[in-house]
Interface confidence: low
């Protein structure tokens, strides 16, 4: 066959879908990959051609769309499961092509088992509510296209396994669920069930999210810087190690970037011949907000290292703040017989 | 009139199994969610576990992989299945129901059914 | 997990004091809370729901308040049957939560 414009395997789009539900599968090649829709395609006379290969298969073999009651079919750029089974795991590939023209593009799909409670190898989304926000609603996602607009499908939600009902801040509203107040015990898997008839059978979608209730705006501050402070010298003679550290906080920001770092004489320590080596730590707290330390670490220092200007600087989306370190070298304690001498000197 | 009667309770050796039943009579357990909160001699209650009442259940951290809750609707009666029993397990286990389908607060409570679990 | 602390563990009063028992939750828990009445022998009986609301059947010298972490049962004129031990529990349905549902409790005695 003639050359073939081959994306390969697009791990980056790796599809689960639940057994036994249905599932719409749009061809990657019009989302990511070429610059014209499947309308344009099929206007210009190219054919989106479907196959698969089994799970530990390396055969290549055309998908059957004579299946009872359609249950594998194509409608346009979308190749639909009504529903999925365990065994249709596997890489499936669509190819665009006519006479002068070939392009595409394989990915894999996994069809994955749920418990009872939904609990699956399912990677799930991650929703972030803002703790004590006022209402906030999370939607039950990735539904569209699988009913048309007039039929109203049932939609249940649950927290865990448990089904949503008279709970005390979280009311399900359709599609959406709102949280009047959000707290920390709402922290959790959220999953909303959709029921739907279809040509006479009931399909049911299942969707879980992940709830994370996070630092509110309302709250945030610019970074606060722990340490270096005004209440701590760090005092050494030369030869010994010497050992800051940055500790700031930072108040949880959504998709803000929280940097750390050292001048050491108004320059970055890579920018300066000083052997000193900085580690950082990370933690976070129940609502995210972060704490970073650097450690600036001397092994040996030395008096023109102890006569430096040592500043911590911080930034995040709400602003940046910086701290100078106390060092300074330390006087040695002068020996008695020497002091009392002077001392007699003196009188 | 409502009632809740919990059986099956006994003394049984470490390491061994027990099922706990709890009859519900006036209530339809279609409607209502169910749970076993337990309380050793002298000490407070202690949550195990809620089921539902469309049937999905949580139990509490430490019993999970032990002891499991279950329901037959058609029977009107709830379960406790516990597995690999510890002395620590030795407890009145009550069964309770929920006000509602999930409203977390316990209405309506058995008497109890003592299990002792002793070498 | 969750953590419910009750104060006092105990208390002596007389018929026709007010008596005031409280909850405080490890973490903001909302109006998630219950309180229920426990005589020796006897199940645990329902008393207050949604932190304030005053269960079917339960006198109206029981009330409850608070929201978040700290919450108060106030009993406003002790009666002879009210000398039992109390206890609160949160009624939030999250899996981390129910081993951790139930606070200590508080005998109330006779003085």
């Known amino acids: 066959s003639e050359r073939c414009d081959d994306w390969g395997l697009d791990t980056m789009r790796q599809i689960q879908v639940f057994e036994d539900e249905p599932a719409r599968i749009k061809c990657p090649l019009f989302e990511h990959f070429l610059k014209f829709n499947y309308s344009t395609a099929h206007s210009a006379g190219l054919t989106l051609i479907w196959y698969w290969t089994r799970q530990d298969r390396d055969l290549e073999e055309p998908i059957n769309f004579r299946l009872p009651e359609n249950r594998i079919s194509k409608e346009k750029d979308v190749l639909w499961f009504r529903p999925t089974l365990l065994n249709d795991t596997g890489n499936y590939t669509c190819m665009l092509r006519n006479t002068t023209y070939c392009s595409k593009v394989a990915f894999p799909l996994e069809v994955v088992q749920k418990d009872s409670c939904f609990n699956s190898p399912m990677k799930l989304p991650v929703h972030k509510l803002y703790i004590e926000y006022g209402i906030q609603r999370i939607t039950c996602p990735n539904v569209d296209g699988y009913f048309p607009s007039s039929v109203k499908p049932t939609i249940t939600w649950y927290m865990g396994c448990y089904k949503i009902q008279n709970f005390n801040n979280v009311i399900p509203e359709g599609m959406n669920l709102s949280f009047l107040i959000a707290l920390i015990s709402n922290n959790g898997n959220y999953t909303c069930v959709v029921t739907y008839p279809e040509n006479g059978r009931t399909f049911h979608l299942t969707r879980t999210l992940t709830v994370k209730v996070v630092g509110s705006p309302k709250n945030a501050v610019p970074p606060v810087i722990h340490s270096p402070n005004d209440h701590v010298v760090y005092e050494k003679e030369p030869g010994e190690e010497l050992l800051i550290p940055c500790t700031v906080y930072f108040s949880f920001l959504m998709d803000s970037r929280n940097e750390v770092w050292w001048t050491i004489d108004g320059k970055k320590p890579d920018d300066i011949t000083i052997d000193v080596t900085i580690n950082e730590s990370i933690s976070h707290s129940r609502t995210e907000d972060e704490t970073r330390t650097q450690i600036l670490s001397i092994k040996k220092v030395t008096s023109e290292d102890l006569k430096r200007s040592y500043v911590c600087h911080a930034r995040s989306a709400k602003g940046e703040v910086a701290k100078a370190a106390k060092v300074k070298q330390k006087v040695p304690a002068p020996r008695y017989t020497v002091e009392l001498a002077c001392g007699f000197g003196a009188t | 009139e409502v009632q809740l009667e919990e059986s099956g309770g006994r003394v049984v050796q470490p390491g061994t199994s027990l099922r706990l039943s709890c009859a519900v009579s006036?209530?339809?357990?279609?409607?209502?969610?169910m749970g076993w909160v337990r309380q050793a001699p002298g000490k407070g209650l202690e949550y195990v576990a809620v089921?539902?009442?469309?049937?999905?259940?949580y139990d509490a951290s430490w019993a999970k992989g032990r002891f499991t809750i279950s329901k037959a609707n058609s029977k009107n009666t709830l379960y406790l299945q516990m597995n690999s029993l510890r002395a620590e397990d030795t407890a009145v286990y009550f069964c309770?129901?929920?006000?509602?389908?999930?409203?977390?607060?316990?209405?309506?409570w058995g008497q109890g059914t003592l299990v002792t679990v002793s070498s | 997990e969750l953590v419910m602390t009750q104060s006092p563990s105990s208390l002596s009063a007389s018929v026709g004091d007010r008596v005031t028992i409280t909850c405080q939750a490890s973490?903001?828990?909302?109006?998630?809370l219950a309180w229920y009445q426990q005589k020796p022998g006897q199940a645990p009986k329902l008393l207050i729901y949604?932190?304030?609301t005053l269960a079917s059947g339960v006198p109206s010298r029981f009330s409850g308040s608070g929201s978040g972490t700290d919450f108060t049962l106030t009993i406003s004129s002790l009666q002879p049957e009210d000398f039992a031990t109390y206890y609160c529990?949160?009624?939030?349905?999250?899996?981390?939560?129910?081993?951790?549902?139930f606070g200590g409790g508080t005998k109330v005695v006779i003085k």
């Open positions: 949604g932190a304030s």
């Open positions: 006036g209530i339809d357990l279609d409607n209502y969610a």
């Open positions: 309770a129901r929920d006000r509602g389908t999930s409203t977390g607060s316990l209405d309506l």
């Open positions: 529990q949160c009624t939030y349905w999250n899996p981390d939560y129910i081993g951790g549902a």
């Open positions: 973490e903001n828990i909302g109006n998630g």
């Open positions: 089921i539902s009442s469309d049937g999905f259940f």
